[in-house]
Interface confidence: low
C-alpha cells in the first residue's frame, strides 16, 4: 500500500469506522443532486442522500472529538461546574420538544427546518473556534467547512426552504466581536460549551435524520 506522508500539521485523522481504505480502486459515491457520469464505482453502489448526510455528520462529530480532546487537555473546563455562568451569555441552538425532532411528536419537515436553522446559527460559533486551537487548527477548519457542506446537503433535502431563517450577518459580527473580547477563562469556557452543544445538537440531528 502506498502511504501518503504528511507535512505541515498532523493529518486530520477523523477515523470513520465505515471508511473503505482501498489502496488501488477507490469507490466513488456521488453526493445528492450531482451527476457523475465519469466515475465508475466498481465495488459498491453510490451513497444515497441519507447515507451521505449520515456519514457527513459522523465525520464532523469525529472532528469535534479531536477538538474537545485538545480543549480538555489544555484546561480544566471539562470538569468545571461553573458552566451555567457562561452558558447564560450564549444563545446556542438546542433541540426542544416543539422542534419535532424527538420520537414523541416527530415531524419530519419541522425537524429538518430546525436542523438547518440550528446549523446556520452555529456557524458564527464555529467561526469563533477558528484560532482557538494550536495543534488542531486544521480540525477546527474541517469542522467549519464540513458543516457548510452538510447545510448544502440538507437544503437539497428540505422542501420548505422559506421556513428557514438565516441569521443576520450584522448581529453575527457583533456577537463574534463580543465573544473574542472576553477574558481568557471565559473564552476557554465558551470554546468548551460550543463544542459540547454542537456535539449534542448533531447527535440529536443524526437520530432524527435516521427516522426520515
Amino acid at each position: 500500500m502506498n502511504s501518503f506522508s504528511t507535512s505541515a500539521f498532523g493529518p486530520v485523522a477523523f477515523s470513520l469506522g465505515l471508511l473503505l481504505v482501498l489502496p488501488a480502486a477507490f469507490p466513488a459515491p456521488v453526493p445528492p443532486g450531482e451527476d457523475s457520469k465519469d466515475v465508475a464505482a466498481p465495488h459498491r453502489q453510490p451513497l444515497t442522500s441519507s447515507e451521505r448526510i449520515d456519514k457527513q455528520i459522523r465525520y464532523i462529530l469525529d472532528g469535534i472529538s479531536a477538538l474537545r480532546k485538545e480543549t480538555c487537555n489544555k484546561s480544566n473546563m471539562c470538569e468545571s461546574s461553573k458552566e451555567a455562568l457562561a452558558e447564560n451569555n450564549l444563545n446556542l441552538p438546542k433541540m426542544a420538544e416543539k422542534d419535532g425532532c424527538f420520537q414523541s411528536g416527530f415531524n419530519e419537515e419541522t425537524c429538518l427546518v430546525k436542523i438547518i436553522t440550528g446549523l446556520l446559527e452555529f456557524e458564527v460559533y464555529l467561526e469563533y473556534l477558528q484560532n482557538r486551537f494550536e495543534s488542531s487548527e486544521e480540525q477546527a477548519r474541517a469542522v467549519q467547512m464540513s458543516t457548510k457542506v452538510l447545510i448544502q446537503f440538507l437544503q437539497k433535502k428540505a422542501k420548505n426552504l422559506d421556513a428557514i431563517t438565516t441569521p443576520d450577518p450584522t448581529t453575527n459580527a457583533s456577537l463574534l466581536t463580543k465573544l473574542q473580547a472576553q477574558n481568557q477563562w471565559l473564552q476557554d469556557m465558551t470554546t468548551h460549551l460550543i463544542l459540547r452543544s454542537f456535539k449534542e445538537f448533531l447527535q440529536s440531528s443524526l437520530r432524527a435524520l435516521r427516522q426520515m
Epitope: F4, P11, V21, P29, R141
Partner: nanobody, 128 residues
C-alpha cells in the same frame, strides 16, 4: 455542474520537470480535499498526492516524496502538481479527484475517504 479538468501533461526526458494543473468548477475548492492519482498501462491505480481543504495539509506517496509538490490556489479554483526529477516509472495517465470530504483520508493513507468526482486525466510520458 461539477467539473475537474487536468492539463500540463506531455513528453519529457528523465530528470525533467512538468507542472500539472487541475482546474475545478461548479463547487468551492476550499471545502474539499483534492488528490492526484496515476495509472500506468497494465498497472493498478496509485495515489500520488493529496491536499486537504483550506489550510492545505499535503500528503505524498513514498514513490514521489521529495520530487513532487502539490499546491492549491483557491482564488483560481485550481490545484497544481509540480513534478521534478521525473523518472521513466512516472509515466502514466494522471488525473485529479475531489474527495467527498474536507481532508485527505484516514491518517493520510492513500486518498482514504471516498472521492466523488474525477477528471479525464492528462498523459505524462518520461522517455529519453
Amino acid at each position: 455542474e461539477v467539473q475537474l479538468v487536468e492539463s500540463g501533461g506531455g513528453v519529457v526526458q528523465p530528470g525533467g520537470s512538468l507542472r500539472l494543473s487541475c482546474a475545478a468548477s461548479g463547487f468551492t475548492l476550499a471545502y474539499y480535499a483534492i488528490g492526484w492519482f496515476r495509472q500506468a498501462p497494465g498497472k493498478e491505480r496509485e495515489g500520488v498526492s493529496c491536499i486537504s481543504g483550506s489550510v492545505g495539509t499535503t500528503y505524498y506517496a513514498d514513490s514521489v516524496k521529495g520530487r513532487f509538490t502539490i499546491s492549491r490556489d483557491n482564488a483560481k479554483n485550481t490545484v497544481y502538481l509540480q513534478m521534478n526529477s521525473l523518472r521513466p516509472e512516472d509515466t502514466a495517465l494522471y488525473y485529479c479527484v475531489r474527495s467527498s470530504w474536507f481532508d485527505c483520508g484516514v491518517q493520510g493513507r492513500d486518498l482514504g475517504n471516498e472521492y466523488d468526482y474525477r477528471g479525464q486525466g492528462t498523459l505524462v510520458t518520461v522517455s529519453s
